[in-house]
């Protein structure tokens, strides 16, 4: 005859405020005869939570039909779950006796513990942008989830980051938890289109974890490099000089032309273009009035970029004589 | 699944230009780069340029600059690669080709080319 | 422009056979690097991204490895289907640029 075992697969269930938990049992062996009991706890201060017999349970369902002679599922399911119900549950046998029945084997007990899921990652940058090379600080939240513990994850697009603190809060016992991780990324100079990820993993979330992003765009400034070049071809009485401005971002960026130290307020043409890496290049155009007046011209581009300080590139035109003696030749 | 596929043969005479077309199906059009790359015969691979469908954002190779123009027309999911002042050393297979998808990790933010036209061969002969 | 050098510019091999390519770039391109297989008449077809990368639906007897400048392409055993010229492509830069091509003929 084979010997009754009370099998209770789950030691710990997770279950929600509001839900419902189904609790399992089942029995190897009809025999010896006699019922199977739900309690929560051990020792004479148990509590009972379901005897198919007597006793009226209304948020108490069983999965099976417990009239079938054969049934040897006894599993449970409780309703609209309450922080109240949190325990050990224990389905117990009982032997036929007279005048009562007498306890007769005990499953191991499945631990009802409230589950809450962690809110959404969010993730918050610095304050201030930071040039390249540089390291910046991100941070990320998730509130509200038990059980406590948890596991958090940093990546820069996909690589996984390891210069970062977690903390989980509070240390002692609580209904919910929170945590805050601190990363500290360091910056390239192609990071505009880059990202930062906050992954959070919890047993509530059943293998999908919750991600949190921050754009690297909102924490990084790329300087400009600036280069002036006096164009080989002249036009008619004027030499074209480009101040080309590369590689920045923001956008934000104001350039002005001066002519041997004073600001020239003569409109110039400029085109805006946008590289693969999320960065800017500007180019600007200045047409300068050769005459015979003019031996030392010296040009000033000067940039100020995202409200940074001002940089500039001077270059002192070459205007040779033949290019003077022409200078008054009409042009078609 | 992912299609790109060229417009026919060419002869060019020398001096003359050439438009290679290059029609997308199966992925959105304006999400990912096309690069051109050519294969002159039994040479190697060589780059072209790069244009964005999205913003038409074009980066050429320094070799071509001022011969090649890359343009799209995304109302049919097409791009444009034009050579002008066209040599007998352009003679080559052109290729469109789909840059795929994936985060900067230098400043080129170049990456590798998943999907290839079928090529088109550009006679260029007097 | 970044070199990429490859070698052997071609190899004789039999089917069954471990292959290995290898590609060095002129300057550190960290793993910013794509292998190409291409057969006759036909369009390069990428195998490997990132260095090491297997591109999805590329069979998993072609591996990837290496980076800063030295790079390595390797077939585990060789197919019928495999003998054709292969070629490595840098990313960082621009202008893109590919190796000379290594031809792996039937031996």
């Known amino acids: 005859e084979e010997e009754l075992q009370m099998i209770q697969p789950e030691k710990l269930l997770l279950v929600t405020v509001g839900k419902t938990a189904t609790l399992h049992c089942t029995v190897t062996s009809l025999l010896p005869v006699g019922p199977v009991l739900w309690f929560r706890g051990v020792g004479p201060g148990r509590e009972l939570i379901y005897n198919q017999k007597e006793g009226h349970f209304p948020r108490v369902t069983t999965v099976s039909d417990l009239t079938k002679r054969n049934n040897m599922d006894f599993s449970i399911r409780i309703s609209s779950i309450t922080p109240a119900d949190v325990g050990t549950y224990y389905c117990v046998k009982f032997r036929k006796g007279s005048p009562e029945n007498v306890e007769f084997k005990s499953g191991p007990g499945t631990e009802m513990a409230l589950g809450a899921k962690p809110s959404a990652p969010v993730v918050l940058g610095p304050a201030a942008r930071t040039t390249p090379e540089h390291t910046v600080s991100f941070t990320c939240e998730s509130h509200g989830f038990s059980p406590r513990d948890i596991t958090l994850k940093w990546f820069k697009n996909g690589n996984e980051l390891s210069d970062f603190q977690t903390n989980v809060d509070p240390t002692g016992q609580s209904v919910a938890y929170s945590i805050r991780s601190t990363a500290r990324v360091v910056l390239d100079p192609w990071d505009v289109r880059s990202q930062v990820i906050c992954e959070v993993a919890h047993v509530t979330l059943q293998g999908d974890p919750l991600r949190g992003t921050a754009n690297l765009s909102e924490a990084i400034r790329v300087p400009p490099t600036l280069e002036v070049t006096q164009q080989p071809m002249r036009v008619g009485n004027q030499v074209n000089v480009t101040c080309q401005v590369r590689k920045f971002y923001p956008q934000s960026l104001q350039l002005t032309w001066s002519e041997n130290g004073n600001v020239c307020q003569r409109e110039t043409a400029s085109t805006l273009t946008e590289n693969k890496d999320g960065t800017y290049n500007w180019t600007s155009w200045f047409l300068v009035n050769i005459s015979d007046q003019r031996d030392d011209v010296v040009l000033t581009c000067q940039v100020k970029h995202d409200g940074q300080l001002a940089v500039s590139k001077r270059l002192a035109l070459e205007v040779t004589v033949h290019q003077k003696d022409q200078s008054s030749d009409a042009t078609p | 699944q992912v299609q790109l596929v060229q417009s026919g043969a060419e002869v060019k005479k020398p001096g003359a230009s050439v438009k290679v077309s290059c029609k997308a199906s199966?992925?959105?059009?304006?999400?990912?780069?096309i690069n051109w790359v050519r294969q002159a015969p039994g040479q190697g691979l060589e780059w072209m340029g790069w244009m964005n469908p999205n913003s038409g954002n074009t980066g050429y190779a320094q070799k071509l600059q001022g011969r090649v123009t890359m343009t799209r027309d995304t109302s049919t999911s097409t791009v444009y690669m034009e050579l002008s002042s066209l040599r007998s050393e352009d003679t080559a297979v052109y290729y469109c080709?789909?840059?795929?998808?994936?985060?900067?990790?230098?400043?080129?933010?170049?990456?590798?080319?998943?999907?290839w036209g079928q090529g088109t061969l550009v006679t260029v002969s007097s | 422009d970044i070199q990429m050098t490859q070698s052997p510019s071609s190899l004789s091999a039999s089917v069954g056979d471990r292959v290995t390519i290898t590609c060095r770039a002129s300057q550190g391109i960290r793993n910013d690097l794509g292998w190409y297989q291409q057969k006759p008449g036909k369009a390069p077809k990428l195998l490997i991204y990132s260095a090491s990368n297997l591109q999805s639906g590329v069979p998993s007897r072609f591996s990837g490895s290496g980076s800063g400048t030295d790079f390595t392409l390797t077939i585990s055993s060789l197919q019928p289907e495999d003998f054709a010229t292969y070629y490595c492509?840098?990313?960082?830069?621009?202008?893109?640029?590919f190796g000379g091509g290594t031809k792996v003929e039937i031996k």
């Open positions: 080709a789909r840059e795929r998808v994936g985060y900067c990790s230098s400043t080129s933010c170049l990456h590798p080319l998943d999907y």
């Open positions: 199966g992925y959105t059009f304006t999400r990912y780069d």
């Open positions: 492509q840098q990313s960082y830069d621009v202008p893109l640029t």
